[in-house]
C-alpha cells in the first residue's frame, strides 16, 4: 500500500508580514534524502528546488526579492523521496504590509492601568478598509481581528499583567494586504492591591531594520518563530 511521507514544515524568514518591496524567504523543511521540493502558491505550482546532495539537506529556501500584493497569499510545500510524495505542509499566509496608509492606535482608559481594569484598543484608518488587526509584540504574539467602517474596537476585557506589552495595529485591505503599522502603544499593567508584583513582558526578538513590528529569526529560534507565524495565521483563516 502506497503511503505518504510526513508533511514538511513551512515558514517565512524574517517574518510572514513583509513590507512591500522588501525581501522574504520561504523555508520548507522536509526530510534528508528528499530529491525535490515544490512550493505551491494559491493551489498552483510556484517553484521547484532539487537539493544537492539530497542526503545532506533537509531544508530548502525559496527567495522572493521584491514583495508585492501579487506575491501575497497562501503558500504550501511538498517534497519527494524517490517516487514517494509527502503530505502538503500547513498553509503559510504571506502578508504584504506598508500598503497605502497608516492607522492610529489608541487605548482606553489609558496606557497605564491596574490589573482588573477593562481595556479597549481602538484602531482607526480613514481609507477604504473594514478589517483591522491588532498585534501584540512578542514570541507568543496575539493577533485579533476587528471590523468597522473606519475604526475597530478591540476589547481586552479586564486585563492582567500578562497583557503588558507593546501593541500595533494594521488596516487590512484583504487577508493578505495590510496597511503600514500604527505607531506602537505600550500597555503597562500593574498588579492589583493584593499582588503588586509585575509580570515580565513577553520575550521579544531583537528589532530588525524594517521596523520593530518585524521579528528577526535567529539560529535556534526558527521553530518558535514559525509557531508564532502559525498562531497569527490561524486568525487569518
Amino acid at each position: 500500500q502506497q503511503q505518504t511521507l510526513p508533511k514538511p514544515f513551512i515558514w517565512a524568514e524574517p517574518h510572514f508580514m513583509v513590507p512591500k518591496e522588501k525581501q522574504v524567504t520561504i523555508c520548507c523543511q522536509g526530510n534528508y534524502g528528499a530529491v525535490e521540493y515544490q512550493l505551491h502558491f494559491e493551489g498552483s505550482l510556484f517553484a521547484v528546488d532539487r537539493p544537492k546532495p539530497p542526503e545532506r539537506i533537509n531544508k530548502v529556501k525559496f527567495y522572493i526579492p521584491d514583495m508585492n500584493s501579487r506575491m501575497a497569499g497562501q503558500y504550501s510545500c511538498i517534497y519527494r523521496v524517490g517516487e514517494l510524495w509527502s503530505e502538503p505542509s500547513n498553509l503559510l499566509d504571506l502578508v504584504v504590509t506598508e500598503m497605502y496608509d497608516t492607522p492610529t492606535l489608541s487605548v482606553h482608559p489609558g496606557p497605564e492601568v491596574i490589573s482588573g481594569e477593562k481595556v479597549t484598543f481602538y484602531c482607526r484608518l480613514d481609507t477604504a478598509t473594514s478589517m483591522f488587526l491588532l498585534l501584540k509584540e512578542g514570541r507568543s504574539s496575539h493577533v485579533q481581528r476587528g471590523y468597522g467602517k473606519v475604526q475597530a474596537e478591540f476589547p481586552l476585557g479586564p486585563v492582567t499583567t500578562a497583557h503588558r506589552g507593546t501593541y500595533r495595529c494594521f488596516g487590512s485591505y484583504n487577508n493578505h494586504a495590510w496597511s503600514f503599522p500604527s505607531e506602537p502603544v505600550k500597555l503597562l499593567v500593574t498588579g492589583d492591591i493584593e499582588n503588586t508584583s509585575l509580570a515580565p513582558e513577553d520575550p521579544t526578538f531583537p528589532a530588525d531594520t524594517w521596523g520593530t513590528y518585524l521579528l528577526t529569526t535567529e539560529t535556534g529560534l526558527q521553530k518558535d518563530h514559525a509557531l508564532w507565524d502559525h498562531t497569527a495565521q490561524n486568525l487569518l483563516r
Epitope: 482606553h108 489609558g110 497605564e112 492601568v113 482588573g116 481594569e117 481602538y122 482607526r124 500593574t190 492591591i193
Partner: antibody, heavy 117, light 107 residues
Framework: QVQLQQPGAELVRPGASVRLSCKAS?????TYWMHWVKLRPGQGFEW???????????NYNEKFKRKATLTVDKSSSTAYMQLSSLTSEDSAVYYC??????????WGQGTSVTVSS | DIQMTQTTSSLSASLGDRVTISCRAS??????LNWFQQKPDGTVKLLIY???RLHSGVPSRFSGSGSGTDYSLTISNLEQEDIATYFC?????????FGGGTKLEIK
C-alpha cells in the same frame, strides 16, 4: 509639568451656545483621553464625556449626549467642549481633566459658566 | 449608572483630629474607587486611587480603605490645609460617577 489651562468664566444668554477650551501642555496630548466634568454647587460632579485626541473618538454620558460636543485641535493641543441650547441648569463650573496614570490625576482650574439674560 | 452616596454632606472637626469620610456605591465597584479633594478656590486634586493607593505628592496622613460597595477616606491628623470638599468616584464602569461630596470644616 502637566498643565490644563481653562478660561475663568463665561457669561452666556439662555438658548445660546458656548465653546469652552482646555489647553494642554507638559505631556503627549494625543496619547491620553481628555475628560470633561460638570460641577454645580451642592450637587457634586457629573462626568460629561471624554475624547481621544489621537483619533477624535468620544464616549459620552447619555445624559449629556444632546448637550455637549467634544472636539480637539491637535495642532494647538487644545480640547473643546461646545454646550448648546443653554438654560439655567447649565450654569456650573466645567472642568477638563486627564488620566495620565490610574485615575483623573490632572485637572484644569475650571471655567465658570453663567447662563443669564 | 452606578450611584455613589456620601451620606455626610458636611463635617466639623478640630485640627489634629482623625477624620473619616464614607462613600457607598449602589453596586460592587471592585475597588476601582478614587477620592478627590476640591479646595475652596475650586482646585481639584486626586488623593487616592484604587481604594487605598496614595497619589504621588499626597501627604501620608491621607489613607483609603474599603471593598465591594463600602469605602472610606481617613485623614489621620487634620491640618488647616485639609479644609476642602472631598468626593469619591467609581471608575469600574462607564459613565464614571461621583458622590455628592463631604465638606470638611474646622470647629
Amino acid at each position: 509639568q502637566v498643565q490644563l489651562q481653562q478660561p475663568g468664566a463665561e457669561l452666556v444668554r439662555p438658548g445660546a451656545s458656548v465653546r469652552l477650551s482646555c489647553k494642554a501642555s507638559g505631556y503627549t496630548f494625543t496619547t491620553y483621553w481628555m475628560h470633561w466634568v460638570k460641577l454645580r454647587p451642592g450637587q457634586g460632579f457629573e462626568w460629561i464625556g471624554e475624547i481621544n485626541p489621537g483619533n477624535g473618538g468620544t464616549n459620552y454620558n447619555e445624559k449629556f449626549k444632546r448637550k455637549a460636543t467634544l472636539t480637539v485641535d491637535k495642532s494647538s493641543s487644545t480640547a473643546y467642549m461646545q454646550l448648546s441650547s443653554l438654560t439655567s441648569e447649565d450654569s456650573a463650573v466645567y472642568y477638563c481633566a486627564i488620566r495620565l496614570r490610574f485615575a483623573l490625576d490632572y485637572w484644569g482650574q475650571g471655567t465658570s459658566v453663567t447662563v443669564s439674560s | 449608572d452606578i450611584q455613589m452616596t456620601q451620606t455626610t454632606s458636611s463635617l466639623s472637626a478640630s485640627l489634629g483630629d482623625r477624620v473619616t469620610i464614607s462613600c457607598r456605591a449602589s453596586q460592587d465597584v471592585r475597588n476601582f474607587l478614587n477620592w478627590f479633594q476640591q479646595k475652596p478656590d475650586g482646585t481639584v486634586k486626586l488623593l487616592i486611587y484604587f481604594t487605598s493607593r496614595l497619589h504621588s505628592g499626597v501627604p501620608s496622613r491621607f489613607s483609603g480603605s474599603g471593598s465591594g460597595t463600602d469605602y472610606s477616606l481617613t485623614i489621620s491628623n487634620l491640618e488647616q490645609e485639609d479644609i476642602a470638599t472631598y468626593f469619591c468616584q467609581q471608575g469600574n464602569t462607564l459613565p464614571p460617577t461621583f458622590g455628592g461630596g463631604t465638606k470638611l470644616e474646622i470647629k
